[in-house]
Structure formats: C-alpha cells, structure tokens
C-alpha cells in the first residue's frame, strides 16, 4: 500500500525541497504531525501542539502547516517518506506517502560544429537522466540523452537550439551557425 499510494516528488541535488501535504488544513484539532523516513525506520520530525518540535537533524525543518523542508538535498535523502497526522484524541486523521527522487540538475548544453562536413554536436556534461533536444530554425530534429550529432545539408547558415532537461531542471543553448560556401572551418 505504501508504494502504490506514494506521491512521486522530484528534488534537485544540493537544493532544498518542501514536502507539502495535499488537501490538508491545519486546525486546533490537530495535535501531532509525524514524519518518518522509511529506509531508516524512524521518526525524522515531529510537531506536537504546545510541545517542542522534534527534528532528527538540522537539515529538516517542520512548518506549522505540516510541510517538511529538507535542506541541501543529498543522494541519501532519496527515500520514501510518510507523514501521519493525529488529532487531540490520538486518532489517525491523515496519512500520506511521498516517494522522493533526487536528480542532479542538467548543465547548459554545449553546441559545437564543423563546417568541413557540416556536422553539429550538442552535448550535456552534467545531470541525471538528461533529455537532449535539437532544433534547427525552430523545427525539432533529434532527441537523445547526452550527445546529439547532426549533419545538416539544407543550408550553410542556420540557427540551432539545443535544450537539455530532466525532472528538476532545464537549460538551453542557441547558436547561429554560418559556414562559408566552400565548407571551410
């Protein structure tokens, strides 16, 4: 049940993320909000009304509305998180599961070309599971992961755009490519 009901959430390595509880409104009836990290099998943060808020470590921050902030995401923060909310009688009011997945942000793609054989390369150096797209004068040409190589023949001058993206970031580069008639570099 835990995995099938999980809310898939994406975070960027080194960045902060807020795990917001959907359709939850804080009220006077709420007495206890508890967050658990499944793989550690333990509480990582707990808010109890009129009591000191518990945090397992300083990278966690628990807001009054139940949102859990995880600061400076690391690879080992990738996990299944569970929040449980209880009322003043100890009744279970709400439970939600978050499947937090972490990716490194993509770097700006680098476009390079050679006029000798009218070949253009677009490459992205950093990022988890990047998706590269190449466009010539606004028209989509190719889709790949880390490197796109394209030989163009239509004209010696064109505007190429290369975009790199993943679940947590998007970067693009634009290069107006112009080659002399004789195909010299």
């Amino acid at each position: 049940k835990e995995i099938t009901n999980a809310l898939e959430t994406w975070g960027a390595l080194g960045q902060d993320i807020n795990l917001d509880i959907p359709s939850f409104q804080m009220s006077d009836d709420i007495d206890d909000i508890k967050w658990e990290k499944t793989s550690d099998k333990k509480k990582i943060a707990q808010f109890r009304k009129e009591k000191e808020t518990f945090k397992e470590k300083d990278t966690y921050k628990l807001f009054k509305n139940g949102t859990l902030k995880i600061k400076h995401l690391k690879t080992d923060d990738q996990d299944i998180y569970k929040v449980s909310i209880y009322d003043t009688k100890g009744k279970n009011v709400l439970e939600k599961i978050f499947d937090l997945k972490i990716q490194e942000r993509v770097s700006k793609p680098k476009i390079s070309w050679t006029c000798i054989n009218t070949t253009l390369t677009c490459e992205v150096m950093n990022g988890t599971d990047p998706e590269l797209n190449l466009y010539q004068d606004g028209k989509h040409l190719k889709l790949s992961q880390r490197v796109i190589t394209h030989k163009w023949t239509t004209s010696l001058s064109a505007k190429f755009k290369c975009t790199a993206g993943n679940k947590v970031s998007k970067e693009s580069s634009v290069e107006p490519v112009s080659c002399p008639e004789k195909g010299l570099d």
Partner: antibody
Framework: EVKLVESGGGLVKPGGSLKLSCAAS????????MSWVRQTPEKRLEWVAS???????YYLDSVKGRFTISRDNARNILYLHMTSLRSEDTAMYYC???????????WGQGTSVTVSS | DILLTQSPAILSVSPGERVSFSCRAS??????IHWYQQRTTGSPRLLIK???ESISGIPSRFSGSGSGTDFTLSINSVESEDVADYYC?????????FGGGTKLEIE
C-alpha cells in the same frame, strides 16, 4: 469505556497456523492505529505488528512474511493471521490501541499461543 | 533496532518511600519513551507518555523525566498496590521495542 477482547489462541504444532481476533468497543475503531504485542514466558514484551488507520502495515522482522495484521472496520475487529509458527512464537498475545500511532494506551486481556510438538 | 536497558532488574522498597526506575536507550530518541505497569495477573497499563506527560486516571505519584538516551520513572510515595513490573517502550523507530522490565517489591 474502551474494551479490547482477544480470542483465537491455543496449542499448535510447529509449522501450523492460527488466526487471532480482537474485538474492540467503546471508541471509533476505524480512526485508531492498532497493534499486536506479545509477552514471552520469560515476561519479555515484544511488539509484533501495527496497522494504521489508513491501512499501512508494520511488522517485526522475525514475523514478516509469516504473520499478517488486518482489520475489519465495519465489525470493529483486529486480526493477526499467524502461519509457519515456531516455538519462539510461544507467548501471550495482546491487542492494543495505538494512540498517536505509538502509545499503547489500552490493552486487551491477552490470548495465549503455545507452539509445541 | 533501538535497545532499551532497564535497571535494576528488581527494586525493593518500603511503603511511603520514593522509588526511581531507569531506562537507557542505545541511541538518542528525543522524548519518544512511554512507561507501563503490569501487575502480576493483569495486562500492561499506560502510566506516562512521551517521557514526562501524565495520563488521565493515573495517580499523581507517578512521574517521568528525561530525554535523549536516559529516562526515569518515579513513584514519589510507594503504596502496596504499586507492586508490579514496570516497562519502558520507545516509539522513535521501528520496530517499537520494550525494556526488559523492573520488578518492584515492597519490603
């Protein structure tokens, strides 16, 4: 008045099965997390399994895959289906209400399980 | 798993004395400790929650303190009906675990 009444215990051979029941009354059963806790003949208390109000399950590693906790919110009954029983499962089994998911604030009278050939 | 160590195994006191039970956790658990009393023929009964919070219907002579790894249950004036086993339980991590218990005897 909160009341928890366990039943279903007995003598069973190693490898055998039993299904324990816990009839709950005096509170909104469906809204509370519930647990099974056992007490060994040496008087050691051992948490066995919990089921949350939303149906999330937690098990002691040594019973995972052998025991199944479940609940019938319409009939206010908590169950523990025990299979592949071992001699080390011999204990008094208590049903407990888990307030805030972690505090056993009410306990039943217990039902005895003996696993022996 | 989080190990809870209770000491001593047996405490023997005279009526009216103050008595303290110790519970030590193998790692820091905040205040996620709860105390139970079990008389000879009965089921466990909740005495204190979250290390120091009182429970409705439990006599005020029972109190709890501590945080982190060291916890104490105290009875400020022992009565004969307090003869029982006393257990601590942690709820910081799964599996929930109990201490081995301390038996209270009246001299």
């Amino acid at each position: 008045e909160v009341k928890l009444v366990e039943s279903g215990g007995g003598l069973v051979k190693p490898g055998g099965s039993l299904k324990l029941s816990c009839a709950a009354s005096g509170f909104t059963f469906s809204s509370y997390d519930m647990s099974w806790v056992r007490q060994t003949p040496e008087k050691r208390l051992e948490w066995v399994a919990s089921i949350s109000g939303g149906g999330f399950l937690y098990y002691l590693d040594s019973v995972k895959g052998r025991f199944t906790i479940s609940r019938d919110n319409a009939r206010n009954i908590l169950y523990l289906h025990m299979t592949s029983l071992r001699s080390e499962d011999t204990a008094m089994y208590y049903c407990a209400r888990s307030s805030y998911g972690e505090i056993m604030d009410y306990w039943g009278q217990g039902t005895s399980v003996t696993v022996s050939s | 798993d989080i190990l809870l160590t209770q000491s001593p195994a047996i405490l023997s006191v005279s009526p009216g004395e103050r008595v303290s039970f110790s519970c030590r956790a193998s790692q820091r658990i905040g205040t996620s400790i709860h105390w139970y009393q079990q008389r000879t023929t009965g089921s466990p009964r909740l005495l204190i929650k979250y290390a120091s919070e009182s429970i409705s219907g439990i006599p005020s002579r029972f109190s709890g303190s501590g945080s982190g790894t060291d916890f104490t249950l105290s009875i400020n004036s022992v009565e004969s009906e307090d003869v029982a086993d006393y257990y601590c339980q942690q709820s910081h991590g799964w599996p929930f675990t109990f201490g081995g218990g301390t038996k209270l005897e009246i001299e």
